[in-house]
């Protein structure tokens, strides 16, 4: 068990031309708040898939009113960290979504209005117990600067929070075969229940006798790096028994990427994701126009006739990045459904389907779904000889052709107001209520918990709200 912590440093206009308009005005003062959603692994999941590692909402920031004629500055932020507790092992690799929300405080009928200002997402490797990692992400003309870390909650320790520490039974030393728990030298490692020899750094167990590997490691004792190179990490020499030692600083420490580039570690070194107008290994090359041919791998360059205006690379299938410099490992996103085998042919993606399934992504069950298609990203589900569409968020009807209002079912309880946006819905709770759907009265016996229970209601009896 442990806690993922996110510290927002600044949210404001990014570098370059086209500064965004201030989200607040004298007529409509507003304040910001943030939502973070965490998912395990490196899969690029849909925005509406559950935040399996957890989610958190920040407090509201200070009220901000734009000064007329002034450029949009960095906006005032909420105090404190966003904390996402996790109950099981820290996965080591994770995906995140950070949303910046605006709460307008004008004279709206029915209370404040919410709107999504910016949304950034990424995938990272992170060991629990390590230092704060710094990051910069851009969404349109906005820039978000933040730091994050994962830390274990006692008695858990280790890079995955899977080793346990217990107070010493004897004051002088730990029991036979048990080591002191750094940095808690006054505590001892709990007796190991994993399979004998299971790597304490790269393996963990949830049942006695098993040895499950963290991402990037394999073998019965999780001592073999998945990478064919001798060492997964660029930080230290290879070791025959443990895979890699991890002393010294990481390649992204001190952020080697210039001009606002963001750094991510790779198995051998580091990689910079550069803002528009910059490229090179460390984003050090600037003043680029389309005449310089900045788009790689057949990317089409648009705009940027003079050094002051940004260019945009339109990448061909299979490539991404501001300069089309990154090859997309499209099979890592597991696009083939129903156990289909993914083949990345470079120019195209192919799915080799298992018997009984068909379609570009093996999404059609030939039994019930033959010849039937679900519109708007819906998937066909077989059932009792009749086809049924499981529709993507925001669509409904037999073939997912009808636009559905996610707020139509009145999902927000206790008088909460529902707001629809592209990644689902958000409930703005009435004062005194909390939760994704305002399900939780903060003080159910107090005046704010309306409606009150009828007289004589005992614990265990239902209270009905229409």
């Amino acid at each position: 068990a442990g806690v993922f912590e996110l510290q927002i440093h600044s949210f404001g206009p990014g570098p370059g031309p086209g500064a965004p308009r201030s989200p607040c005005s004298a007529r409509l003062p507003c304040r910001l708040f943030f939502r973070v959603c965490l998912k395990p692994g490196l899969s690029e999941e849909a925005a509406e898939s559950p935040c399996a590692l957890g989610a958190a909402l920040s407090a509201r920031g200070p009220v901000y009113t734009e000064q007329p004629g002034a450029p949009a500055p960095d906006l005032p932020l909420p105090d404190g960290l966003l904390q996402v507790p996790f109950r099981d092992a820290w996965p080591g690799t994770f995906s995140f979504i950070i949303e910046t929300w605006r709460e307008e405080l004008g004279d709206q009928i029915g209370g404040p209005a919410w709107s999504l200002l910016a949304r950034v997402a990424g995938r990272r490797r992170l060991a629990a117990g390590g230092p704060w990692a710094r990051d910069i992400q851009r969404a349109g003309a906005w820039e978000l600067r933040f730091s994050y870390r994962a830390r274990c909650e006692p008695p858990a320790v280790g890079t995955a929070c899977t080793r346990l520490c217990r107070p010493r039974s004897a004051p002088s030393r730990c029991g036979p075969g048990l080591r002191p728990c750094a940095p808690l030298e006054d505590e001892c490692e709990a007796p190991l229940v994993c399979r004998a020899g299971c790597s304490p750094e790269h393996g963990f167990c949830e049942q006695p006798g098993e040895c499950r590997c963290l991402e990037g490691w394999t073998g019965p004792l999780c001592t073999v790096p998945v990478s064919t190179s001798s060492c997964l990490s660029p930080r230290g020499p290879s070791s025959a028994t443990t895979g890699c030692l991890v002393p010294g600083p990481g390649p992204c420490d001190g952020n080697p990427c210039a001009n606002g580039g963001s750094c991510s570690e790779t198995p051998r070194s580091f990689e910079c994701t550069c803002p528009r107008g910059f490229y090179g290994l460390r984003c050090e090359v600037s003043g680029v126009t389309c005449a310089d041919g900045p788009c790689f791998n057949g990317g089409l360059c648009v705009g940027g006739a003079d050094p002051d205006s940004a260019y945009i690379c339109h990448c061909p299938p299979g490539f991404q990045g501001s300069n089309c410099e990154k090859r997309v490992d499209r099979c890592s996103l597991q696009p083939c459904r129903n156990g289909g085998l993914c083949l990345d042919l470079g120019h195209a993606l192919r799915c080799r389907c298992r018997a009984g399934f068909a379609g570009p992504r093996c999404e059609h069950d030939l039994d019930d779904c033959a010849g039937r298609a679900c519109a708007n990203g819906g998937t066909c589900v077989e059932g009792g000889g009749a086809h049924r569409c499981s529709c993507a968020l925001g669509f409904g009807g037999r073939d997912c052709r009808e636009r559905a209002d996610p707020c139509a079912a009145r999902p927000c309880a206790h008088g909460g107001r529902c707001y629809a946006h592209f990644s689902g819905l958000v409930c703005a709770c009435a004062p005194g209520y909390m939760g994704a759907r305002c399900e939780f009265p903060v003080h159910p016996d107090g005046a704010s918990a309306l409606p009150a229970a009828p007289p004589g209601l005992r614990p265990g009896d239902p209270q009905r709200y229409l």
């Epitope: 559950p50 957890g54 989610a55 994704a436 009905r464």
Partner: nanobody, 119 residues
Framework: EVQLVESGGGLVQPGGSLTLSCVAS????????YGWYRRAPGKQRELVAG???????VYSDSVKGRFTISRDNAKNSVYLQMNSLRAEDTAVYYC?????????????WGQGTLVTVSS
């Protein structure tokens, strides 16, 4: 309809840990939320932690980082893992269940389980 049964309360020393469990029997629905509330002597009942049907969680400021709420949909159960307990955590802890069926919402409460933190 829906009955809630809590367990796991008891006497524990400061700094210790306890896990509370709550099982919902009857006819729980898939669109639901579970929560844990507590009432300390002489105070009104307050929210401790809650978990929605989409898995999102809320915690009161006083327990953040110490308590963890989780649920097991297959067992219609919710759990509250309480670590680093303090004397001020002493209270009767109530399980809360909230569900929506056909646009109508209902909430249910358990009978409560006593947690005493004392040396």
């Amino acid at each position: 309809e829906v009955q809630l049964v809590e367990s796991g309360g008891g006497l524990v020393q400061p700094g210790g840990s306890l896990t509370l469990s709550c099982v919902a029997s009857g006819s729980p629905s898939s669109i639901n939320a579970y929560g844990w509330y507590r009432r300390a002597p002489g105070k009104q009942r307050e929210l401790v932690a809650g978990i929605s049907s989409d898995g999102s969680k809320v915690y009161s400021d006083s327990v953040k980082g110490r308590f963890t709420i989780s649920r097991d949909n297959a067992k219609n159960s919710v759990y509250l893992q309480m670590n680093s307990l303090r004397a001020e955590d002493t209270a009767v802890y109530y399980c809360y269940y909230f569900r929506t069926v056909s646009g109508s919402s209902m909430s249910y409460w358990g009978q409560g389980t006593l947690v005493t933190v004392s040396s």
